[in-house]
Amino acid sequence: MMTGTIETTGNISAEKGGSIILQCHLSSTTAQVTQVNWEQQDQLLAICNADLGWHISPSFKDRVAPGPGLGLTLQSLTVNDTGEYFCIYHTYPDGTYTGRIFLEVLESSVAEHGARFQIP
């Protein structure tokens, strides 16, 4: 039985032009993480593979940086980056766990610093 749970930063906001860290954490399972996919609407942003390391999708290379840890840093944010992001953990032997983060990119400088993973 799959016992694990994914904790995420939940709903977060950031300023246009700024950066944000997307972070998920898998807990309550002894399963081994074999790969983490970071996805946005059926599009792959990046992969962190336990054996092969990081792969950033070519279309995001300029604006996405690996880490910290299994997280993902989005840079030079635009309003178009607003939306849902998914961390998909491939684990052995449990299978797949999915976490969801909603990012809102704000035009103004009143972006709430609601997430502890926010980069100032």
Partner: antibody, heavy 119, light 107 residues
Framework: EVQLQQSGPELVKTGASVKISCKAS????????IHWVKQSHGKSLEWIGH????????NYNQNFKGKATFTVDTSSSTAYMQFNSLTSEDSAVYYC????????????WGAGTTVTVSS | DIVMTQSHKFMSTSVGDRVSITCKAS??????VAWYQQRPGQSPKLLIY???YRYTGVPDRFTGSGSGTDFTFTINNVQAEDLAVYYC?????????FGGGTKLEIK
Amino acid sequence: EVQLQQSGPELVKTGASVKISCKASGYAFTGYYIHWVKQSHGKSLEWIGHITCYNGATNYNQNFKGKATFTVDTSSSTAYMQFNSLTSEDSAVYYCARSNYRPWYFDVWGAGTTVTVSS
Amino acid sequence: DIVMTQSHKFMSTSVGDRVSITCKASQDVSTDVAWYQQRPGQSPKLLIYSASYRYTGVPDRFTGSGSGTDFTFTINNVQAEDLAVYYCQQHYSTPYTFGGGTKLEIK
């Protein structure tokens, strides 16, 4: 909905080649792995190999090395398998299937492509 | 290559019954075994992976167990739509191999 749509049936001559396609939809294609599986008429399933969709790395069953070639086109989320030097033994249904990176179980399958080799 | 042996090519059961299908690996595959259902004219469908993990959306009347070399797939309260061929597969090492299949017939 996660789907793998395969190309239609093929009737080919002995010694010819065939290229089968598998178009993915409903998920981030490059984050997963596409496997190819052979099922001869009324028989069991045989794993041909797999391709890593984001970098094109391949892993072939020794029994199919030199016979099968896998490629991907990430722009169209499509995987391809080319089968060369066809003989009657290659007449079968060929499936593409998706997997995670370990454990390697196949969670989504295409409908299959029937290849008939005739002399 | 690891050989997966399903000793029964055919099994007959009745609606409402319980049926168990066995699969034996030629060497230790830990718990790296999946079970698939293939209905007539259809592609295989994943039911169980890692020996005992039920795939998303699969009814809980389907269960899997075993480790090492001996594995069992059980259907409780068999339904008419369970008429199919069931395959085990080892996902322990390449080349990944399948059992010969067990055809479940409904009396």
